[in-house]
């Protein structure tokens, strides 16, 4: 790496999680740098020979990236004078999951920070009466998940039952062979009550709620993604 | 400003080997947040990637043309070329080079493109 | 390797009048997928990259956007200039791929 500077700087990374498919980001900051063209950024990951990303000069060098992120990455140009030095990464695969180094070179000194990166599937589930069903029952979607979620479902007046027997959740694999359309069904639901519908996978949890009374249906999902920050 | 210019013969005979080359002007072909790609359109079709190089060598060629391309670059004469060999008929197309960018990958700017006819 | 669908193939607009080209994928590639515009005997233009973002020195009258597998480039009111043959790109993954263009036409 040969780096330059007497002083150790703070540099400081946040484990996150990629979504499979859709375009994610490994965050890292450092100590702020007025002089473009004295900053180095090197983005490195665990096992792979080669760099993820180089920026340096005030400008990308990829000639020593690895051919698994080519194309693929880029930092935020117009703010690493602002000690931003996180990566943007397209079209996260199940491979870039790891551990990853973020080295900072500055005008004030050197130093790196290590982020583990996780990678799956994750999405808001929906939740729909079903109006097909011989009793009044609840269909909750949700289109893409990997690893294999858990699925529970809870209910505001039956606060602590086990619905575990009055579900049925399936997995459907999807096209590209990796990530899962998870369906849950809830039977025998009453009117004037709300039902969650809760995902979970050691990388995110998402929950759908649905209110059904005699004149109208009220929704709401969340997603929040495990085990996030420095 | 950045400009881009395709040379080259312009007509090949079947089973032989296209060779064209691109001029970069108004920049350095080794400023590093780009390929340098190629792209073909044959007579009143659509357009088709055919791969792309950094400036330090590195090519990632379209997979249905891999076996029949190579992409080099003179970084000296802020050069790069496309060979295609065994060509056909198939291959008669508009020749366009263009730089890329290395996230996001659009095409920006295009050279005015080049028309090579395989005939014999 | 990832299709691109361009609909219509023909689009016949007046001037001043809006149009509405759509372009569809395959399968998701998220908001990358740019635009461009070709005129007879000339190269393509970028008009819009990242589903949305106009290049530089375009009208504001192209605007793009989309996301996933549906996407969507409406030009507010067409100048004459804008009669030409629109391209989608997706560059989510190699090989990066073209739709088939969409033709606007003067009607």
């Known amino acids: 790496f040969g780096i330059s500077g007497k002083h150790f700087i703070t540099v400081t990374t946040f484990t996150s999680a990629g979504n499979i498919g859709e375009d994610g980001t490994l965050s890292c900051t450092f100590e702020p740098d007025i002089k473009l063209n004295g900053i180095v950024i090197q983005w490195l990951k665990e096992g792979i020979k080669g760099l993820v990303h180089e920026f340096k000069e005030g400008k990308d060098d990829l000639s020593q990236q690895h051919e698994m992120f080519r194309g693929r990455t880029a930092v935020f140009a117009d703010q690493v004078v602002v000690g931003n030095a996180s990566l943007r990464l397209k079209n996260v695969q199940l491979t870039d999951a790891g551990t990853y180094t973020c080295y900072i070179r500055t005008s004030k000194g050197k130093g790196n920070a290590n982020l583990e990166y996780k990678t799956g599937a994750f999405s808001m589930p929906e939740i729909n009466v079903d109006y097909n069903a011989s009793s009044e029952s609840l269909r909750c979607e949700a289109p893409r998940w990997f690893p294999q979620p858990t699925v529970a479902w809870a209910s505001q007046v039956d606060q602590g039952a086990n619905f575990s027997e009055v579900s049925n959740t399936s997995f459907e694999l999807n096209s590209e062979n990796v990530t899962m359309k998870v369906v849950s069904v809830l039977y025998n639901v009453t009117i004037n009550n709300t039902y969650s519908c809760m995902i979970e996978n050691d990388i995110a949890k998402a929950t759908g709620d649905i209110k059904v009374t005699d004149s109208e249906v009220k929704r709401r999902s969340q997603l929040q993604l495990l085990n996030s920050g420095p | 400003q950045l400009q881009l210019q395709e040379s080259g013969p312009g007509l090949v005979k079947p089973s032989e080997t296209l060779s064209l080359t691109c001029t970069v002007s108004?920049?350095?072909?080794?400023?590093?947040?780009?390929?340098w790609g190629w792209i073909r359109q044959p007579p009143g079709k659509g357009l088709e990637w055919i791969g792309n190089i950094y400036y330090s060598g590195s090519t990632y060629y379209n997979p249905s043309l891999r076996s029949r391309v190579t992409i080099s670059v003179d970084t000296s004469k802020n050069q790069f070329s496309l060979k295609l060999s065994s060509v056909t008929a198939a291959d008669t197309a508009v020749y366009y080079c263009?730089?890329?960018?290395?996230?996001?990958?659009?095409?920006?700017?295009w050279g005015q493109g080049t028309l090579v006819t395989v005939s014999s | 390797e990832i299709v691109m669908t361009q609909s219509p193939a023909t689009l016949s607009v007046s001037p001043g009048e809006r149009a509405t080209l759509s372009c569809r994928a395959s399968?998701?590639?998220?908001?990358?997928l740019a635009w461009y515009q070709q005129k007879p005997g000339q190269a393509p233009r970028l008009l819009i990259y990242g589903a949305s973002t106009r290049a530089t020195g375009i009208p504001a009258r192209f605007s793009g956007s989309g996301s996933g597998t549906e996407f969507t480039l409406t030009i507010s009111s067409l100048q004459s200039e804008d009669f030409a043959v629109y391209y989608c790109?997706?560059?989510?993954?190699?090989?990066?791929?073209f739709g088939g263009g969409t033709k606007v036409e003067i009607k």
């Open positions: 790109q997706q560059y989510h993954s190699f090989p990066f791929t």
């Open positions: 263009a730089r890329e960018g290395s996230y996001p990958n659009q095409f920006d700017p």
């Open positions: 108004g920049g350095s072909i080794k400023s590093g947040s780009y390929y």
């Open positions: 399968q998701s590639v998220s908001s990358n």
